[in-house]
């Protein structure tokens, strides 16, 4: 990002104000919604995303099949409260006073429940499967290069260690993409999973958080590939509480 | 070229205010940032505050908090440093220096320096 | 503030030698981090800017490294120009603070 003040963006993050008012008259961006100061020369925390999001004016069987704890975010948007390093807090509520418990990337584990619900630890989501349809195509694309495109460009855009990028199945017109990282796999610096697969999803609704870049132009072999419906589950370290209720619905 | 061009040497008496000058061409003043930096004889750089012309903001460090005030006049181009109730340890060259354009907080433009005496 | 700690104080080295200067910041501070030379009577001239990222013009025997709180610049051949006080500098947060320099001097 650049210091002269009409180029002060934040390549990685477009909900975000900039100014050269960091230290030094660095380029500093802060995330809307949070006033947060954020490193553009990585992805924003999802939890951010989401708090900026919020803050804006309103615009079947698998090939994998997904463990029984696998998450699905089916609350949708909501305003979270993120901790000071831009992570969600374990507890969330809303403004009647309706709280719950998420994992590391703000999906309700628990049932809701009142004030009094305890969440005594942030739940990480260590296995992502993002599960992918696309729009037919004259023929089925060669696996091999599908598996590399998708691994670039989660390497390329999204910064992600390609040891985070478990595998990638496909069997026509499905994709299936496995992230996974351990608290113990995550080092200082390395792209947060659930991140990655955040920007993956916005990118494929046609929402691109990068500031300015065009949006996600995927092609396999010159092949176009557009997604027609995307499902994302999420596996947490610790299986979620749910009561049987909701199970059995 | 790009470059900034500092006023000349001052001697001023303890308990006194030293005003240095800070004069930029070559690139559009309002756009980059003025930090001032100091650096006593035989000792090591000491940063002392800053300032964004376009939108007025400053920062001082601590130490100098109180004593120093950055301005900048845009039809000239020109930031300014003023110390007030100067000591013999003020005694130093005065540096003033624009943050470099990748916008890292990096200083890659710097005046040729003020050497500014405190002495009774 | 974050105090930035410079490695050695002082070193003898001749023309030709390779040469390599740490930094140590007192927190992190990401990769907000510059490396100067500065001549006696003369302004700091940078050469380093975000920790690895060259300055236009500065010849390419300076490379820096390093991210959070150790930091290195190296000098793979040592011309006569750059016998000379070294400074890194960090901009992660206010105030801007300096290291302690380091003086490089002729074996």
């Known amino acids: 990002h650049t210091a002269a003040q009409d180029n002060c963006t934040c390549p990685t993050n477009k909900m975000t104000v900039c100014s050269p008012d960091g230290p030094g008259g660095r380029c500093q961006c802060r995330a809307l919604g949070s006033g947060m100061a954020v490193d553009c020369s990585t992805l924003t925390s999802k939890c951010l995303l989401l708090k900026a999001r919020m803050s804006a004016p309103k615009n079947a069987r698998t090939l994998v099949r997904p463990s029984e704890h696998a998450l699905v975010d089916n609350d949708g948007l909501y305003d979270p409260d993120c901790d000071p390093e831009g992570r969600f807090k374990a507890r969330q509520c809303n403004q009647t006073s309706v709280c719950w418990c998420v994992n590391s990337v703000g999906v309700r584990r628990t049932d809701k429940g009142d004030l009094s619900l305890r969440c005594d630890e942030l739940v990480r989501t260590h296995h992502i499967l993002i599960d992918l349809r696309h729009r037919p195509t004259a023929g089925a694309f060669n696996h091999s290069d599908l598996d590399a495109e998708l691994r670039r460009l989660f390497r390329e855009r999204y910064r992600l260690h390609p040891k985070f990028v478990a595998a990638v199945h496909y069997e026509q017109p499905t994709i299936q993409i496995e992230l996974r990282q351990n608290t113990s796999q995550k080092a200082a610096g390395d792209v947060d999973i659930g991140d990655a697969a955040y920007y993956f999803e916005r990118d494929i609704k046609g929402e691109s958080l990068f500031q300015g870049r065009g949006g996600l132009d995927l092609r396999v072999r010159g092949e176009p590939l557009q997604v027609e419906r995307t499902l994302i589950y999420y596996l947490d370290e610790i299986p979620p509480k749910f009561s049987m209720k909701r199970l059995t619905a | 070229q790009v470059q900034l061009v500092q006023s000349g040497a001052e001697v001023k008496k303890p308990g006194a205010s030293v005003k240095v000058s800070c004069k930029a061409s070559?690139?559009?003043?309002?756009?980059?940032?003025i930090n001032w930096v100091r650096q006593a004889t035989g000792r090591g750089l000491e940063w002392m505050g800053w300032?964004?012309?376009?939108?007025?903001?400053?920062g001082y460090a601590q130490k100098f908090q109180g004593r120093v005030t950055i301005t900048a006049d845009e039809s000239t181009s020109t930031a300014y440093m003023e110390l007030s109730s100067l000591r013999s340890e003020d005694t130093a060259v005065y540096y003033c220096?624009?943050?470099?354009?990748?916008?890292?907080?990096?200083?890659?433009?710097w005046g040729q320096g003020t050497m500014v005496t405190v002495s009774s | 503030d974050i105090q930035l700690t410079q490695s050695p104080s002082s070193v003898s080295a001749s023309v030709g030698d390779r040469v390599t200067i740490t930094c140590r910041a007192s927190?992190?501070?990401?990769?907000?981090l510059a490396w100067y030379r500065q001549k006696p009577g003369k302004a700091p001239k940078l050469l380093i800017y975000?920790?690895?990222s060259l300055q236009s013009g500065v010849p390419s025997r300076f490379s820096g490294s390093g991210s959070g709180t150790d930091f290195t610049l190296t000098i793979s051949s040592l011309q006569p120009e750059d016998f000379a006080t070294y400074y890194c500098?960090?901009?992660?947060?206010?105030?801007?603070?300096f290291g302690q320099g380091t003086r490089l001097e002729i074996k």
């Open positions: 220096a624009r943050p470099n354009t990748g916008g890292d907080g990096a200083f890659d433009i």
């Open positions: 070559g690139y559009t003043f309002t756009n980059y940032g």
């Open positions: 300032m964004n012309p376009r939108s007025g903001n400053t």
């Open positions: 927190q992190g501070i990401k990769s907000w």
């Open positions: 975000r920790a690895r």
């Open positions: 500098q960090q901009a992660n947060s206010f105030p801007v603070t």
